[in-house]
């Protein structure tokens, strides 16, 4: 029968008695940076090309004893579980190996970096189809290491790597936290995270999404037939390999930042158990198990848009968080959060050349988050109205004024140090979508995009008494791109948008009165395009 | 050009050994190994095991266990097979391929135990 | 290993379609997404005309098909030529091994 992690990630219309779905990624090359392999294990002969590459550490120890197969190993599975014959993803995916840990599996960042260069140097001399590199790899933070994988991605390459197994936040480990990388961590068959001896997987805002990785069967370096059960965020990560081969060979021209959209999108969402989490990464860990599209082809005509968490400012007065998209993402919105509540808000301002999302922290915060929202909208043109805090009791509001803009998102800065401890303005009047509405002491945001065929509209969810959590979703069709609070709320403590819903979070409800002030509303703008959805009916 | 060129024919009495070589050329030697297959006159086809060109490592079928050594030389890309205590119903073409997907064929090499 | 279970001879005229069936187990064809065959002319080493269930290698007409369903494999051949008269062996993996069919004669009446 089928193993659990392709029964997982394969959608129900290609669940037959055997795992064969459509195209098996043979339009791509997948690079794997591991140890040795045994290239002719029947399970991948002929599929691995073992490149004359090698910049491996010496092992540890005078007794170490060196035994092939154990040499072999981690990267054999590996090779495996991304185009396996029998347990493989992408069945059709052609790969190189690249040796870069020993036989402990031990490796360097400076082995890692040359290796990376040698795939840049491939590529140049011999340019293929899509290339996905796969580093099932994690060591300490590295700028460096970061570095040259976003040289890489900017040259059009896809790297998938491992959020690590130590139980901790993946942004402490390279190249799990460099941002143009796709980060994976582990769930197991039961869509838990994945618990290894004493540690687990990492988690926090520098993961992407999970995937299978625990018990999962592979080749085995023991024999040329044999199969052996592995675990681990390398595995996680081999699976979302094997999903990006299979994506990009049903579309070539694919981008990172698509990619990455559609691997968000089509994932399991809400699945995980965030209870296995630090309480304070609960929030910042995406809830997605990847899985292959429901249908390879298709997808173009939605409108897709992530959440990107900012590192935390800190907690002095005058800290700041920025979060950015990547270079051919809109941000489309900007929210922020705090976990005491203090918060001075959030804006969004240029940044060499591009709109950022900035929060920030007031004085006696622990610190804030900003959280950008960041969509794929080609031809956009999108720009930031402000206003200035408003003399008028009604508070201040912004509209986008140009023609055939639409609103996508609303901000609002204040400089005062609390604004809890401020009248808080009337109710404003409703019916205005193309409207930010804000306290009177705040300067409002909003973001105003130009894109053929794109319509918005605002959508909010009021509840009088006080609840820690408000949400409110966008329908089957339409994608978040907004989240903000209604002004008027001395307690909340932020709003972001987790998939297609917009949270917004308040204190706890037993330290607040159920006054006027306990009403909590979040907004929600939805956003969809018809261009997207005409344009993908004539390419059928 | 993949090609696997396989030696002459032998003509063996009972209780002697035979080694058929089989040169590979045209590929990455390490990402397959070699099988072994004989066909008996009027007869099918019959997986006798493989040897791997990265480790050496080898896969009998369980008939062939005690009689049969398959071995390489990568220096030369070539792969060996040797049987012994040959019987007059081993009489029969051995073919060396490709890997375990055996995509590419050797021409054969007829194998006559006779006394 | 025991053999597949091919049927001994097959035969059609030029033009029609025909069908080979391969039964294994499920330890073997069903267990597997590894199940190929061979077409053999006499004299001549075998060649592989489907890998992988349904995959034709390069060179090899789309008149020669490949499915499977649980424990039996089937090699389709349509537009039946004079050429195709040879004999077609399916093989599979196994846990450990490789197990051949008995193989089965094709005549093109």
């Known amino acids: 029968s089928i193993p659990w992690n392709l029964e997982r990630i394969t959608p129900p219309r290609y669940r037959a008695d055997e795992y064969q779905p459509p195209d098996g990624g043979s339009l791509v090359e997948v690079y794997l940076l591991d140890t040795s392999i045994q290239s002719d294990h029947r399970e991948i002969e002929g599929r691995v090309m073992v490149t004359d590459f090698e910049n491996v550490p010496e092992e540890d120890g005078t007794r170490f004893h060196r035994q092939a197969s154990k040499c072999d190993s981690h990267g054999t599975h590996l090779a495996g579980v991304v185009s396996g014959r029998d347990a493989g993803v992408a069945k059709g995916a052609s790969m190189r190996s690249l040796r870069v840990l020993n036989c402990q599996g031990k490796g360097t960042v400076s082995g890692t970096l040359i290796g990376l260069e040698f795939i840049r140097k491939s590529q140049l001399v011999q340019p293929v189809g899509p290339l996905v590199v796969l580093l099932p790899l994690a060591g300490g933070y590295s700028r460096v290491l970061n570095a040259a994988c976003q040289r890489l991605a900017r040259a059009g390459v896809v790297l998938v790597t491992a959020a690590g197994n130590f139980r901790d936040d993946a942004c402490l480990y390279s190249p799990a936290s460099a941002p143009e990388v796709i980060t994976v961590g582990a769930t197991n068959a039961q869509d838990q995270p994945v618990t290894l001896g004493t540690l687990g997987t990492n988690f926090g805002r520098c993961v992407d999404l999970f995937a299978p990785g625990e018990d999962i069967i592979g080749a085995s370096s023991d024999c040329s037939t044999c199969f052996v059960s592995q675990s681990g965020t390398s595995q996680a990560a081999a699976h979302v390999a094997g999903i990006a081969a299979m994506m990009l060979s049903a579309e070539p021209e694919l981008t990172l930042a698509e990619l990455r959209q559609r691997l968000i999108h089509f994932s399991a969402k809400d699945v995980i158990n965030e209870a296995w989490f630090p309480e304070d990464q609960r929030v910042l860990t995406p809830n997605l198990v990847a899985a292959l599209p429901p249908s390879t082809h298709g997808a173009g005509w939605q409108l897709f848009c992530r959440t990107v968490w900012s590192a935390h400012s800190g907690p002095t007065r005058m800290a700041t968080a920025v979060a950015r998209c990547a270079p051919d993402e809109e941000l489309l919105s900007c929210s922020s959060f705090s976990r005491s509540g203090k918060r001075r808000g959030e804006r969004m301002e240029a940044q060499g050349g591009k709109l950022v999302c900035r929060a920030h922290n007031a004085f006696g915060g622990e610190g804030v988050y900003a959280i950008a929202r960041c969509c794929l909208l080609p031809q956009a043109n999108c720009s930031v109205h402000t206003a200035p805090p408003a003399e008028a009791s009604m508070g201040t509001r912004v509209h986008c004024h140009q023609q055939g803009h639409v609103l996508t998102g609303c901000s609002s800065h204040w400089e005062v140090e609390d604004l809890g401890t401020h009248k808080p303005p009337v109710l404003r009047p409703r019916g205005q979508p193309n409207q930010c509405v804000g306290h009177r002491e705040a300067s409002i945001h909003a973001s105003c995009c130009h894109a053929p065929g794109l319509e918005c509209k605002v959508k909010e969810h009021g509840i009088p008494a006080p609840q820690e959590q408000v949400t409110v979703a966008c329908e089957e069709g339409w994608t978040l791109t907004g989240c903000s609070a209604l002004p008027g709320t001395s307690h909340v403590l932020g709003a972001y948008a987790v998939d297609n819903t917009c949270v917004v979070r308040s204190r706890d409800v037993s330290t607040t009165g159920s006054t006027s002030e306990g009403a909590v509303t979040a907004v929600a703008i939805c956003c969809r395009s018809r261009h997207l959805a005409q344009a993908s009916q004539e390419l059928q | 050009e993949v090609q696997l060129v396989q030696s002459g024919a032998e003509v063996k009495k009972p209780g002697a050994s035979v080694k058929v070589s089989c040169k590979a050329s045209g590929y990455t030697l390490t990402s397959y190994g070699i099988s072994w297959v004989r066909q008996a006159p009027g007869q099918g086809l019959e997986w006798m095991g493989w040897?791997?060109?990265?480790?050496?490592?080898?896969n009998y079928a369980q008939k062939l266990q005690g009689r049969g050594t398959m071995t390489r030389d990568p220096s030369t890309s070539t792969a060996y097979m040797e049987l012994s205590r040959l019987r007059s119903d081993d009489t029969a073409v051995y073919y060396c391929?490709?890997?375990?997907?055996?995509?590419?064929w050797g021409q054969g090499t007829t194998v006559t135990v006779s006394s | 290993e025991s053999a597949l279970t091919q049927p001994a001879s097959v035969s059609g005229s030029p033009g029609q379609s025909i069908t080979i069936s391969c039964t294994g187990t499920s330890s073997d064809v069903g267990g597997y997404n590894s199940v190929s065959w061979y077409q053999q002319h006499p004299g001549k080493a075998p060649k592989l005309m489907i890998y992988e269930v349904s995959n034709r290698p390069s060179g090899v007409s789309n008149r020669f098909s490949g499915s499977k369903s649980g424990n039996t494999a089937s090699l389709t051949i349509s537009g039946l030529q004079a050429e195709d008269e040879a004999d077609y062996y399916c093989?599979?993996?196994?846990?450990?091994?490789?197990?051949f069919g008995g193989g089965t004669k094709l005549t093109v009446l």
């Open positions: 093989n599979s993996y196994t846990s450990t091994s490789m197990v």
């Open positions: 391929a490709r890997g375990y997907g055996m995509d590419v």
């Open positions: 040897v791997s060109f990265y480790n050496g490592n080898t």
